[in-house]
């Protein structure tokens, strides 16, 4: 009873630094409470971007302070990292977690490449 | 640098009780979960017990459900193990254990022996 | 409950030889680690993913299968490896591991 996560292999943020992709989980049992967590994988360091835990039926919320915004509907949570810069090119993994009820289940997406190219400064007009 | 360190072991009679911790430094405990693992002399690893994040999740091996109680506090950064009604089979090395991001235990402490004897 | 068996319980080889330790679960197992133990240490871990190498492991551990398969290759053992190796199961609770293959000095 493996969990399987998909999500897409490319997504390129728009000029204004945001990126939005899908990640669906095929879930091997009836959770009613999930976690779901968004990584940023860069050489062998693992960080994490944003993480939000939600009722299934409820919206997703994360923190105030959070770079994620995200809506969920079923096994799928649309999310969105907002004020990339290129340094953040990346590999942006999602993480589900099925907390509740037991049993636990992990599952892990491939990883999504965020591509980010800091928009050209204005040229100064006269 | 990670480090965790348990603390709270000895030698205890069957039926009494026990508390263990583990004082976590250099993360976010709090974005973790924490796992206590345990090893009987000379036998292999046992997973005893997890607590999610921000403590409402927690599950337990069913050796010791209903006698052991997993708790944090994220002010402190440290981890607990309540024992109670504690069993000749409890005896063991318990380490705490970090779940890293990616799901194995990438940190563990250097564990604290509990001896339950008469 | 995944139940992992590992093989063979003891492993007698000499440094510089392969060893190569096996671990096969009772059900597919979607998330594999293996973990090195010496006595009177805590456990390590070495790879998790069945096949990634944690921070600061050598590239002389592997590890490869999927399913039910799963095999952690020691290409040429230093004196430092001989230890006891633990596969563990992460996907789902509870949490298993294998009883443990003790890779001895012949």
């Known amino acids: 009873k493996a969990m399987h996560v998909a999500q897409p292999a490319v997504v390129l943020a728009s000029s204004r630094g945001i990126a939005s992709f899908v990640c669906e989980y095929a879930s091997p049992g009836k959770a009613t409470e999930v976690r779901v967590t968004v990584l940023r994988q860069a050489d062998s360091q693992v960080t994490e971007v944003c993480a939000a835990t939600y009722m299934m039926g409820n919206e997703l919320t994360f923190l105030d302070d959070s770079i994620c915004t995200g809506t969920s509907s079923g096994n799928q949570v649309n999310l969105t990292i907002q004020g990339l810069r290129a340094m953040d090119t990346g590999l942006y993994i999602c993480k589900v977690e099925l907390m509740y009820p037991p049993p636990y289940y992990l599952g892990i997406g491939n990883g999504t490449q965020i591509y980010v190219i800091d928009p050209e400064p204005c040229p100064d007009s006269d | 640098q990670v480090q965790l360190v348990e603390s709270g072991g000895g030698v205890v009679q069957p039926g009494r009780s026990l508390r263990l911790s583990c004082a976590a430094s250099?993360?976010?405990?709090?974005?973790?979960?924490m796992h206590w693992v345990r090893q009987a002399p000379g036998k292999g690893l046992e997973w005893v017990a997890v607590?999610?994040?921000?403590?409402?999740?927690?599950f337990y091996a069913d050796s010791v459900k209903g006698r052991f109680t997993i708790s944090s506090d994220n002010s402190k950064n440290t981890l607990y193990l309540q024992m109670n009604s504690l069993r000749a089979e409890d005896t063991a090395v318990y380490y705490c254990?970090?779940?890293?991001?990616?799901?194995?235990?990438?940190?563990w402490g250097q564990g604290t022996l509990v001896t339950v004897s008469s | 409950e995944i139940v992992l068996t590992q093989s063979p319980g003891t492993l007698s080889l000499s440094p510089g030889e392969r060893a190569t330790l096996s671990c096969r679960a009772s059900?597919?197992?979607?998330?594999l680690a293996w973990y090195q133990q010496k006595p009177g240490q805590a456990p390590r871990l070495l790879i998790y993913?069945?096949?990634s190498r944690a921070t600061g492991i050598p590239d002389r551990f592997s590890g490869s299968g999927s399913g039910t398969d799963f095999t952690l290759t020691i290409s040429r053992l230093e004196p430092e490896d001989f230890a006891v190796y633990y596969c563990?199961?992460?996907?789902?609770?509870?949490?298993?591991f294998g009883q443990g293959t003790k890779v001895e000095i012949k």
């Open positions: 607590i999610w994040y921000d403590g409402s999740n927690k």
């Open positions: 993913g069945a096949s």
């Open positions: 563990q199961q992460y996907g789902s609770s509870p949490w298993t």
């Open positions: 250099g993360f976010t405990f709090s974005s973790y979960g």
């Open positions: 254990a970090r779940g890293g991001h990616l799901g194995s235990f990438d940190y």
């Open positions: 059900q597919s197992v979607s998330y």
